[in-house]
């Protein structure tokens, strides 16, 4: 048995006569043989669930669910209740109604076995019938909504009449009907005004019924019509077995360059027309098991269950359903030497499904793990300016397909043939497994004998120690111009184009900083700033070279404070800025301010 609502509302007036009917509560059956029996909780409750008093005023007919006054609620009774309401004015009280077979403790009131009945209290006697508006004659102030379980026997779930009005204003005629389309499973009995289901409902066909209740009031010659929404929600049960959309029960996958732990290798989708079990219970009751195969497969793969609610069309309306994605995921990084093919089976069990048929599916994954061999091109040729500053990025080295790698740890090293000409360094970028070449020693760049630099690039897979090698030939171009000692170490200090471009800074490939003119559109990623190279800084990402020194690109790398209009980067730097952004790395501060059109002296004074 279950209540068709979790809450009911009615009005109470001072000195309403004993015997006044108040309202009906309704229970629906889960099985044809069930007979409801209602009982009231012992207490009346007030604001914030305050227990006010034993309920001496309201009774219920156990078999019909009719609540009525068994004694009048007078002023003194009301004041007695008000005193206990923690000092709040007593505007509403409520009672708990239980379905008898359920031996719920009084303290708890949870649908489906308990409903609350709220009474709005009016410190006046019942108004004259002639003063009541049609809306007050027809419907309670709070619009009801109903919940009906699918596949359950049909039954009565509502009674339209406002019983106190019918009892105290017998001369006013009130008629009700339901506006509904053809073939809907509800009827309103013209005599009793009871609303019932005609047949068992199927949530997978329709989940919500947005009906309209029409009330016609006849008072003498006057006729008025009032319409209110009458929503019914159908509650789900696990009556649908999981299925494969379009019958796809097998997925094939190749593991090659993406070998990192947590990589999703393949996904199979399971559809279930139900939305139960609820999300909290779902993973526990909708199980997936990787069936035992060889030990290597068990250690290497795991299955992740990702349920998601979706909408499907049924009979012209949308109903909720669930799609379950089962992802085959790498449990560990795979060595580049690993080479095997296997079939994996996953058993999916909707353990709440009662049939007919089985709530079990078998998913198949065909997986090929291919080995990866390291290759570098035979030779790299690059050029570098003699004016390049320390940490200037001059190029990349990359084993074949390195951009696609994940979970493969390749380290790059440079071996110089000329001991005194070891100008360059290399660092491995975790993002794309490439090696970034940068200027490490500017003194060597200036030596006349270091006009051509010869290196051997060695790429080593850290797990297997497999290697690839390539020649690197670097031509040093241009003439050296001594840097000015007064120039800031960081290009980012400069706030204006002129002062930016007449200085160099750490990370500058040309020996000169570059001005990036912003788009001037409020707080933007494209803010104006001074950079060692606009190719790499700022780009919203503190790369592996930039991490070596905060002076290279504080716009991407600063962990300190940013003053002015900006959006902070994740996890550091400036993601977006207002106007021009400049930085003082040693103070760990950046400033984003409107484009400056004042004269230079003002800027210096304002520093």
């Amino acid at each position: 048995l279950y209540f068709s609502r979790d809450a009911y509302w009615e009005k109470l007036y001072v000195d309403q006569a004993a015997g006044t009917p108040l309202l009906y509560v309704h229970a629906l059956r889960d099985a044809p043989e069930e007979v409801p029996s209602f009982r009231l909780g012992q207490h009346l409750y007030g604001t914030y669930r305050t227990r006010l008093h034993e309920n001496n005023w309201i009774c219920i007919q156990e078999d019909t669910g009719l609540l009525y006054l068994n004694r009048s609620l007078d002023h003194s009774s009301w004041e007695k209740l008000s005193v206990r309401n923690r000092g709040f004015p007593l505007l509403t009280v409520y009672l708990k109604v239980f379905l008898s077979p359920t031996s719920l403790r009084e303290g708890e009131c949870q649908w489906p076995g308990c409903a609350r009945v709220y009474f709005s209290f009016f410190n006046t006697s019942f108004p004259a019938c002639s003063s009541l508006k049609p809306r007050e004659l027809c419907f309670p102030e709070t619009r009801p909504s109903f919940r009906i379980r699918e596949n359950r026997p049909p039954g009565t779930f509502h009674q339209f009449r406002l019983l106190p009005v019918q009892f105290l204003c017998p001369n006013i005629s009130v008629a009700y009907r339901l506006l509904e389309g053809e073939g809907l499973p509800f009827r309103c009995a013209p005599d009793s005004l009871e609303v019932s289901t005609r047949w068992a409902l199927d949530r997978e066909q329709r989940e919500k019924y947005e009906l309209v209740a029409v009330c016609t009031v006849h008072a003498g010659a006057r006729e008025e019509v009032v319409m209110v929404p009458f929503p019914v929600t159908v509650y789900d049960e696990d009556d649908s077995a999981p299925t494969f959309p379009a019958g796809v029960d097998t997925a094939s996958a190749v593991v090659e360059f993406k070998r990192k732990e947590d990589t999703v290798v393949a996904t199979l989708r399971v559809f279930d027309a139900d939305v139960v079990p609820a999300s909290g219970e779902l993973v526990r009751r909708y199980t997936s098991t990787l069936l035992p195969g060889d030990t290597w497969a068990q250690q290497t793969f795991r299955v992740e269950h990702w349920p998601n609610e979706t909408s499907v069309q049924a009979n012209g309306s949308f109903v909720r359903a669930t799609v379950h994605d089962y992802r085959l995921v790498l449990n560990r990084n795979l060595s580049i030497s690993e080479n095997r093919t296997m079939q994996l089976a996953v058993l999916v069990n909707d353990s709440d499904f009662q049939g007919p048929g089985a709530g079990v599916l078998l998913l198949h994954f065909n997986v090929s793990v291919l080995p990866v061999s390291l290759h570098l091109p035979s030779t790299y040729s690059l050029s570098v300016s003699r004016r390049a500053r320390r940490f200037a990025q001059i190029g990349k080295v990359c084993v074949e397909n390195c951009q696609a790698f994940s979970g493969i740890n390749v380290q790059y090293k440079l071996h110089s043939s000329g001991a005194n000409c070891s100008t360059l360094g290399v660092v491995t970028s975790a993002e794309d497994t490439s090696g970034i070449l940068f200027v490490n020693d500017t003194k060597a760049l200036r030596r006349p004998k270091c006009a051509e630099l010869h290196y051997m690039v060695v790429a080593t897979d850290q797990q297997t120690s497999r290697q690839a090698q390539a020649q690197l030939l670097v031509t040093v171009e241009g003439s050296y111009v001594a840097e000015e000692a007064g120039c800031p170490l960081s290009c980012a200090v400069s706030k204006r184009r002129l002062e930016c471009e007449e200085c160099g800074g750490l990370g500058s490939p040309t020996g000169r900083c570059e001005w990036r003119q912003g788009d001037g559109k409020g707080i933007t990623r494209n803010f104006s700033t001074c950079s060692p190279s606009t190719k790499t800084c700022p780009d919203g990402h503190c790369d592996v070279v930039e991490t070596q020194d905060i002076n290279i690109c504080p716009q991407d790398c600063l962990r300190g404070s940013i003053v002015g209009g900006h959006e902070p980067g994740e996890p550091r730097g400036i993601k977006a800025g207002y106007g021009t952004c400049n930085c003082f790395p040693e103070e760990e501060k950046c400033f984003c301010e409107p484009e400056d059109i004042q004269d230079p002296l003002c800027d210096e004074l304002c520093r």
Epitope: E484, A485, D549, E586
Partner: antibody, heavy 119, light 107 residues
């Protein structure tokens, strides 16, 4: 507040060595370039040596090149000047000074330590 | 090396006077010039950097101007505490050089 305190000065014979220290506090030492500047008694200021914030680059005046070595220990917030083959003309008050990477002028100076080279 | 020549070497003036000290560089140093004040037995103190920018905490009677090779330090109204030796300093080249100094005396 920013403080620079020099130590290690004293009287030394020509040809001998001395090591000066400059202890820094009140700022993030590792972020700043540092200098040694000297002043002979009754004379003007004379730049001696410079070291980058990270120790990656050093510069020396011609008069001390090959004899003096500048170094720093960022973990101890200390700047050093190793002075070898000292001469009488190296007699001076030696100051350490701070160089903010964003502005590059010598913005804070220590109170100095006196080195006297005499037989 | 860049030579820095200061003039005059000595300057006698009275409280309330406006005084100007000149510094000339042997080649262009753009605006990379600092002015220091030094009192006997004390370390130099920055007054002006980048030729014309007043150091924080320095009274506004001090001002600097110039760029390239010609620079001036002006004290608009001498105060008793201003009598000291003043040095210019170029930081354009890593061979830093100082002017020989200007001694400002009470007349």
């Amino acid at each position: 507040q920013v403080q620079l305190v020099e130590s290690g000065g004293g009287v030394v014979q020509p040809g001998r060595s001395l090591r000066l220290s400059c202890e820094a506090s009140g700022f993030t030492f590792r972020n700043y370039g540092m200098h040694w500047v000297r002043q002979a008694p009754g004379k003007g200021l004379d730049w001696v040596s410079t070291i980058y914030y990270d120790g990656s680059d050093e510069y020396y005046s011609d008069s001390v090149k090959g004899r003096f070595t500048i170094s720093r220990d960022n973990s101890k917030n200390t700047l050093y000047l190793q002075m070898n083959s000292l001469r009488a003309e190296d007699t001076a008050v030696y100051y350490c000074a701070r160089d903010p990477p964003s502005f590059r002028y010598f913005d804070y100076w220590g109170q100095g330590t006196l080195v006297t080279v005499s037989s | 090396d860049i030579q820095m020549t200061q003039s005059p070497s000595t300057l006698s003036a009275s409280v309330g006077d406006r005084v100007t000290i000149t510094c000339r560089a042997s080649q262009s140093i753009r605006s990379w010039l600092t002015w220091y004040q030094q009192k006997p037995g004390k370390a130099p103190k920055v007054l002006i950097y980048k030729a014309s920018t007043l150091e924080r905490g320095v009274p506004s009677r001090f001002s600097g101007s110039g760029s390239g090779t010609e620079f001036t330090l002006t004290i608009s109204s001498l105060q008793p505490e201003d009598f000291a030796t003043y040095y210019c300093h170029q930081y354009s080249s890593y061979s830093y050089t100082f002017g020989q100094g200007t001694k400002l005396e009470i007349k």
